[in-house]
Amino acid sequence: QEFHFGPCQVKGVVPQKLWEAFWAVKDTMQAQDNITSARLLQQEVLQNVSDAESCYLVHTLLEFYLKTVFKNYHNRTVEVRTLKSFSTLANNFVLIVSQLQPSQENEMFSIRDSAHRRFLLFRRAFKQLDVEAALTKALGEVDILLTWMQKFYKL
């Protein structure tokens, strides 16, 4: 079994490993998340994403997590087990993104644009919160992201 985000195939990443890493940090993250009214990965971001769209969307979402979320969060955590779990998530996200080759062909413009609009909904929600709250919430919602990604883990 492998991840198949439409035409983009990802090898060497097992959802179970991602989940184990998330579960190790989940209680810490979700306990610190005081804003229950807002959601970053809202339904409109991840619902009814076509296979073709999925490659663009997972690429932009994971890059955002790597460049913005993990990069800014590791120095706020002191517990060794939590730190290692962040690294496991980050390294697996790097492995996934490194293998993705979203098509830049002109005929894919509408699909690319649709995926980008979904990403902008997520980023807008992220920017509406203060930095600390946004980082905490984004990490707390990794389970939503993993649940969505797992739909693309196929034979």
Epitope: Q9, K11, G12, K84, S87, N91, V94, S98, Q99
Partner: antibody, heavy 118, light 109 residues
Framework: QLQVVESGGGLVQPGGSLRLSCVAS????????MSWVRQAPGKGLEWIAG???????YYPDSLEGRFTISRDNAKNTLSLQMNSLKSEDTAVYYC????????????WGQGTQVTISS | SSALTQPSAVSVSLGQTARIACQGD??????ANWYQQKPGQAPALVIY???SRTSGIPERFSGSRSGGTATLSISGAQAEDEADYYC????????????FGGGTHLTVL
Amino acid sequence: QLQVVESGGGLVQPGGSLRLSCVASGFTFGDYAMSWVRQAPGKGLEWIAGITWNGNTYYPDSLEGRFTISRDNAKNTLSLQMNSLKSEDTAVYYCAKGGIGATVFGSWGQGTQVTISS
Amino acid sequence: SSALTQPSAVSVSLGQTARIACQGDSIGNYGANWYQQKPGQAPALVIYDDDSRTSGIPERFSGSRSGGTATLSISGAQAEDEADYYCHSADSSNYFLSVFGGGTHLTVL
């Protein structure tokens, strides 16, 4: 038995080109990222190129586009094309399984010597 | 200059504990791996993901991490542990790229 074997090293004049090859066996080559790592005489290890199973390539900025990594999954072969060679490229060149970002170099070849001298 | 900093040399008395530190911004995000290299040989993976020991590696080898510093420890160092040790992580400015520390030569006295 997992194995990677490099070949193609030798003596080249500055400004010249060389193509290194690496043949892998004992694992499903087409499922893994591969890398080239070099070691200049008396110096440390330097990662110089990485490639995912599907051909996405990564290089350190320091190489200035002189080296190109490629692979042929059907032939279990990894290659490194080196152009505009300089004396500072003199080193033992290792082929290694893995190595995108912080992911491990799980298996190494014995290396092939490249000498750049006039 | 390397993005990962480790001492160029460490000495330890036979049977004592040797510690080699490796410091770098990216270690906080991505962790570290450690390789052992003996003269005339290819490097070999000793510790991966901060603290996981490669199969076949003696239990005296262990790894840990605190923030942006990873540490390789060898408790009860043996003569055969004399070698060069390299830490490895992702590049701090581009997580797709790999980077090694400058290497530490361990001498067992």
